[in-house]
């Protein structure tokens, strides 16, 4: 008789990333008997929830159930019914909810309570919704990319899984940019740290890792823009803000109450003689860059070396994967290629920002104007953050790899979070079994 493959025992997991600007649901699958192997879990689906981030539902919590319906129903379709009850569901909320909690624990709790109630109505094994710490967000992002790059595997391969994988086991650093925060995580050369708050120790697959991580709350691209506007309106002579970070000819009215809604602008808050002001774009990269730099306080550092705002940062080491909004923005601007130097990126940004708004709208007719209008700022902000904030140089720029997916799985904290919560990253190297799940009988 012909050999027949044994049916694979497949497991699934769901993680919802409740970010500041939107929520995404990720479905992961893996062969059950290979749970402790490295690199076996992969993403089968991403479903982007329609609407803003959950923190924006504070005034309309009754709409949260409907908000989550489409993606949860999609999960119901993708995952075989027989697996529903044993499929764990986790929701992690990030900086948008950290900011809401900073303003009011009650409001943050209320949103999470309604989210939990909504997710409990599905046939999956709901494991809870919580606000993850900035440290966790950084650490899980680092775990995700290194897991997907095969950095934790002890087996050396003669082939490369992904373009930027080198055969050495040196881990990649992780650069994550969201709407409300940004994280930097890497293994520094020196094991000792001057700042215990930024130090993490892991033992993964039999190896010890001493990791540096920091999450800069309010330095995600959206909150950084609010900060910049709040800073610049302080010195405006009237209710018109001529802004170099927006294309020439661009105009937008901003409510002062919206500007001061977030704790991120608290340091710039002042009584203004108007309730609204108008942004008028002048599209000048250099001036925009200068304005962005004012958000980074580099004059004070209680350590041997700092990033900005007095936060310790050890010397950069090795290659870095830059994902989430780092990738989305740079990909839109067509600047993710390994061959594009930092000087070239700056040149392209100068050109892009100076293009008239009408021209930009015509060239990118399919892109929502709200997003389209902010790419000049976001691109400039990314350059400023990486170069002046994190101290990358024209030379070390080539060590930054803008990554969207690795082997079909999105780079981000969600996979690392699930691997940790399902105990799928063993501290010790698993003993290799003689037969794999695809053994023939």
């Amino acid at each position: 008789t012909q050999n027949k493959a044994l049916p694979e025992n497949i497991k699934y997991g769901i993680v919802l990333d409740a970010g500041s600007s939107h929520t995404s649901l990720y479905i992961y699958k893996w062969p059950a008997e290979k749970e402790n192997d490295t690199g076996v879990v992969h993403q089968v689906e991403e479903c982007r929830v329609k609407g803003p981030g959950i923190s924006k539902y504070v005034q309309k919590v009754n709409e949260i159930g409907i908000y989550l319906t489409d993606c949860m129903e999609r999960a119901r379709e993708v995952i075989p019914r027989s697996q529903h009850q044993e499929t764990p569901v986790y929701l992690g909320a990030t900086a948008g909810m950290r900011l809401l909690r900073m303003e009011s624990e009650e409001l943050a709790d209320r949103v999470l309570d309604v989210v939990e109630r909504s997710l409990s109505n599905y046939p999956f094994d709901f494991q809870g919704a919580r606000i993850i710490t900035g440290q966790e967000e950084g650490a899980y992002g680092w775990i995700t990319i290194n897991y997907l790059l095969g950095k934790f595997s002890q087996k050396t391969r003669w082939f490369s899984i992904v373009p930027y994988e080198t055969n050495n086991q040196e881990t990649f650093g992780a650069l994550d940019l969201g709407g409300a925060s940004t994280q930097i995580t890497f293994v520094p050369q020196n094991q000792t740290t001057e700042s215990p708050d930024n130090a993490l120790q892991f033992r993964l697959y039999g190896k010890d890792y001493n990791v540096y991580t920091h999450s800069f709350l309010c330095y995600g691209k959206d909150q950084a823009l609010w900060q910049k506007l709040a800073k610049d309106i302080q010195v405006a002579s009237n209710e018109i803000l001529r802004d170099p970070c927006f294309h020439p000819g661009y105009k937008k009215v901003v409510n002062v109450s919206d500007l001061y809604k977030t704790p991120c602008t608290k340091r710039f808050e002042m009584t203004l003689p108007f309730q609204q002001f108008e942004i008028q774009g002048i599209g000048n990269y250099q001036q925009c860059h200068q304005s962005v730099l004012e958000l980074f306080n580099t004059s004070y550092c209680p350590y041997s070396q700092c990033a900005f705002n007095g936060i310790f940062l050890p010397p950069l080491q090795g290659d870095f994967g830059a994902f989430s909004a780092f990738y989305f923005v740079m990909n839109f601007l067509n600047l993710t290629s390994e061959k594009v130097s930092q000087e070239k990126v700056t040149e392209m940004m100068k050109k892009f920002c100076s293009q008239p708004w009408e021209e930009i709208k015509t060239s990118y007719a399919g892109v929502k104007e709200k997003y389209l209008s902010e790419y000049c700022f976001s691109g400039t902000y990314i350059l400023s953050l990486l170069l002046q904030g994190y101290h990358f140089t024209a030379d070390s720029w080539e060590h930054i790899h803008f990554i969207g997916k690795i082997q079909g799985s999105d780079a981000g904290w969600t996979l690392g979070y699930m691997l940790n919560l399902t105990n799928m990253i063993p501290a010790e190297q698993p003993l290799s079994t003689p037969l794999s799940h695809s053994t023939y009988v």
């Epitope: 009650e106 709350l217 309010c218 608290k266």
Partner: antibody
Framework: QVQLVQSGAEVKKPGASVKVSCKAS????????MHWVRQAPGQRLEWIGY????????TFNQKFKGRATITVDTSASTAYMELSSLRSEDTAVYYC?????????WGQGTLVTVSS | DIVMTQSPDSLAVSLGERATINCKAS??????????MYWFQQKPGQPPKLLIY???NQGSGVPDRFSGSGSGTDFTLTISSLQAEDVAVYYC?????????FGGGTKVEIK
């Protein structure tokens, strides 16, 4: 576990200034606001103001505006409240409390006595 | 400013009996479906301890005999069965609007 430890008691002359410190531990200092509340002998609790440790922005009770200053040293996870132009009615126990709107954790209190 | 008026000023209750304290706000302290109302217990020489948040939720480690109710402007703290260790001053507080304000306090004693 969350802890807020305040500096020791102070005796000040009228017209002088006092600076009280509050050292936080057991949580990410920049994730929560820090409030200051005082209680004069036999009186109700009185809210002074708060700071956003993340960026140093602060909000005050109008009654203390111009006289109270709240600052932070994030590297030391410490908040400070300075009250200037002291008068005898400022004699009170001064507390720091962590929270957005929920004051779940309080310092042990610092007695400030204003006397000539 | 929102004025918080507590009643009574003091209260003497027998051990094991129910104690009820009221707090009235000069305007509603509700927002987005949440009551920004809190109850604290303070013993001599100690900082206040959070008992109730959001009008009716128990603070962590707070015994079940403490409960809160109410919404809008009228709120109540109830101690279902008074224990000797409950002798203290109780304060209500609102954080709906700056300046955050406290009630004048209610002294609870054993009868």
């Amino acid at each position: 576990q969350v802890q807020l430890v305040q500096s020791g008691a102070e005796v000040k002359k009228p017209g002088a200034s006092v600076k009280v410190s509050c050292k936080a531990s057991g949580y990410t200092f920049t994730d929560y606001n820090m409030h200051w509340v005082r209680q004069a002998p036999g009186q109700r609790l009185e809210w002074i103001g708060y700071i956003v440790p993340l960026n140093g922005g602060s909000t005050f009770n109008q009654k203390f505006k111009g006289r109270a200053t709240i600052t932070v040293d994030t590297s030391a996870s410490t908040a400070y409240m300075e009250l200037s132009s002291l008068r005898s009615e400022d004699t009170a126990v001064y507390y720091c409390a962590r929270g957005g709107t929920r004051f779940a954790y309080w310092g042990q209190g610092t007695l400030v006595t204003v006397s000539s | 400013d929102i004025v918080m008026t507590q009643s009574p000023d003091s209260l003497a209750v027998s051990l094991g009996e129910r104690a009820t304290i009221n707090c009235k706000a000069s305007e509603s302290v509700d927002n987005f479906g949440v009551s920004f109302m809190y109850w604290f217990q303070q013993k001599p020489g100690q900082p206040p301890k959070l008992l109730i948040y959001g009008a009716s939720n128990q603070g962590s480690g707070v015994p079940d005999r403490f409960s809160g109710s109410g919404s809008g402007t009228d709120f109540t703290l109830t101690i279902s069965s008074l224990q000797a260790e409950d002798v203290a001053v109780y304060y209500c507080q609102q954080t709906k609007e700056v300046p955050y304000t406290f009630g004048g306090g209610t002294k609870v004693e054993i009868k």
